[in-house]
Interface confidence: medium
């Protein structure tokens, strides 16, 4: 006995895993299509099969799924200092990377740029620089970090957060000011 | 008649827990895969879980896998659903659904259970 209820009372339906609802007859459920693949017709019944086609050059689809087309693949942004890791295929979109000693910064969730890894001149290496960080430094003495890049502190102004790592260096320089209005 | 009777619902914090019941009755429980299907405000149905007939087997949708554990106890007639590390986008009323065939979709009665997931 398949339990059944009158339409007045049934709400809905919905298929599991790796199904779906066919668009014109909700009693159906059809196979989704294999990634690589896009749905071209609506299986005709129960048990037959979902009709799928390969995806075209320059399209893809990475899992498995009921859509009309395949999606067009990505563009590595060159002019943020982009690079082709691997090439879009049927099944997966393109891969985009740095190159060796950048590292990615994300202006947004789907958008990074390249940048050089800081060197940490006239520091040293705090952290080594990741695939989505840059190097973090820590300077020499008479150095402050500024834009993780070490600073003499020649260039240390009253106003800057440097004061406190720059202190005997600031008072050095106030002492020959004091010395010269006298 | 066909009846399943959702329950355990609540409100919960980001990361607590919860454990839904369904109580069948009107057909032969033990004969049939049942799931979990949810509605989140404003969308559509999603299938969340499913067991097999006997509990040997146990699917989940991704964003759920590693979180939520569904279970049946063919004795009382009740499927559960274990929510652990809740999250706001859990927030959806959820339907206990029986599974009648490979073909066919899952149907769901009740008035289901709401889980709002808030800090």
């Known amino acids: 006995l398949v339990p059944h209820l009158g339409d007045r009372e049934k709400r809905d339906s919905v298929c599991p895993q790796g199904k779906y609802i066919h668009p014109q007859n909700n009693s159906i459920c059809c196979t989704k299509c294999h990634k690589g693949t896009y749905l071209y017709n609506d299986c005709p019944g129960p048990g037959q099969d979902t009709d799928c086609r390969e995806c075209e050059s320059g399209s893809f689809t990475a899992s498995e799924n009921h859509l009309r087309h395949c999606l067009s693949c990505s563009k590595c942004r060159k002019e943020m200092g982009q690079v082709e890791i691997s090439s879009c295929t049927v099944d997966r979109d393109t891969v985009c990377g740095c190159r060796k000693n950048q590292y990615r910064h994300y202006w947004s969730e789907n958008l990074f740029q390249c940048f050089n890894c800081s060197l940490c001149l006239n520091g040293t290496v705090h952290l080594s620089c990741q695939e989505k960080q840059n190097t973090v430094c820590t300077c020499h003495a008479g150095f402050f970090l500024r834009e993780n890049e070490c600073v003499s502190c020649s260039n240390c102004k009253k106003s800057l957060e440097c004061t406190k790592l720059c202190l005997p260096q600031i008072e050095n320089v106030k002492g020959t000011e004091d010395s010269g209005t006298t | 008649e066909v009846q399943l009777l959702e329950s355990g619902g609540g409100l919960v914090q980001p990361g607590g827990s919860l454990r839904l019941s369904c109580a069948a009755s009107?057909?032969?429980?033990?004969?049939?895969?049942m799931g979990w299907v949810r509605q989140a405000p404003g969308k559509g149905l999603e299938w969340v879980s499913q067991?097999?007939?006997?509990?040997?087997?146990?699917y989940y949708t991704h964003s759920v896998k590693g979180r939520f554990t569904i279970s049946r106890d063919n004795s009382k007639n009740t499927l559960y659903l274990q929510m652990n590390s809740l999250r706001a986008e859990d927030t959806a009323v959820y339907y206990c659904?029986?599974?009648?065939?490979?073909?066919?979709?899952?149907?769901?009665w009740g008035q289901g259970t709401l889980v709002t997931v808030s800090s």
């Open positions: 009107g057909f032969t429980f033990v004969k049939y895969s």
């Open positions: 067991i097999s007939d006997t509990a040997d087997r146990t």
């Open positions: 659904a029986i599974y009648t065939g490979r073909w066919a979709p899952f149907e769901y």
